[in-house]
């Protein structure tokens, strides 16, 4: 299969609500009409799939119903949002893009975005 460059930010800090967003950009060598995007988490040399979606160019990304990810596409950019993150989810999140159709098939894997998640401090009880 043919290789393709994928770019993503090096570091992202999740919001206090446990939401992190980043852009995954790929250098499409041709005019792909069908794309598959997968987010993988690498931590302690273990790689696990976080979510995956396919989309037709110009349409919304379709994630599984129980996915913690949402996303939109614009040209060769995919805007990804991961929700429900906690401190233990801190890790390297890698964007993988496959151009499924038309042939030839292209595969690109980004260097990863280090997402830092800080659990919010509980509000102290206040005496009135």
């Amino acid at each position: 299969c043919k290789a393709m460059h994928v770019a993503q930010p090096a570091v992202v800090l999740a919001s206090s609500r446990g939401i992190a967003s980043f852009v995954c950009e790929y250098a499409s060598p041709g005019k792909a009409t069908e794309v598959r995007v997968t987010v993988l988490r690498q931590a302690d040399s273990q790689v696990t799939e976080v979510c995956a979606a396919t989309y037709m160019m110009g349409n919304e990304l379709t994630f599984l119903d129980d996915s913690i990810c949402t996303g939109t596409s614009s040209g060769n950019q995919v805007n990804l949002t991961i929700q429900g993150l906690r401190a233990m989810d801190t890790g390297l999140y890698i964007c993988k893009v496959e151009l499924m159709y038309p042939p030839p098939y292209y595969l690109g894997i980004g260097n990863g975005t280090q997402i830092y998640v800080i659990d919010p401090e509980p509000c102290p009880d206040s005496d009135f």
Partner: nanobody, 119 residues
Amino acid sequence: EVQLVESGGGVVQPGGSLRLSCAASGGTFSFYGMGWFRQAPGKEREFVADIRTSAGRTYYADSVKGRFTISRDPSKNTVYLQMNSLRPEDTALYYCAAEPSGISGWDYWGQGTLVTVSS
């Protein structure tokens, strides 16, 4: 060294069926994904189908959706491609491929098995 060996190719009439097999040997097989690609003479290599082994989730190219089925038998380290309602345009060399991890890419490839659909 991991080896992938395909079998099951042959000549079949339009509308017929074939079942391709891909057996992995020579290593440990906690593959992230296994898939099938094909290449017709003078054409680019094309994605056909894959299965992501942890979730058992399958994905198909539009051109084969509803006609081809990918499955696996972990106990035999084997992945299958059941091909029904074959068409002349399905004629190609079919390759099995394996992804050791989600970020490795398709590191392992078989030698291919030829499928010819002709009356």
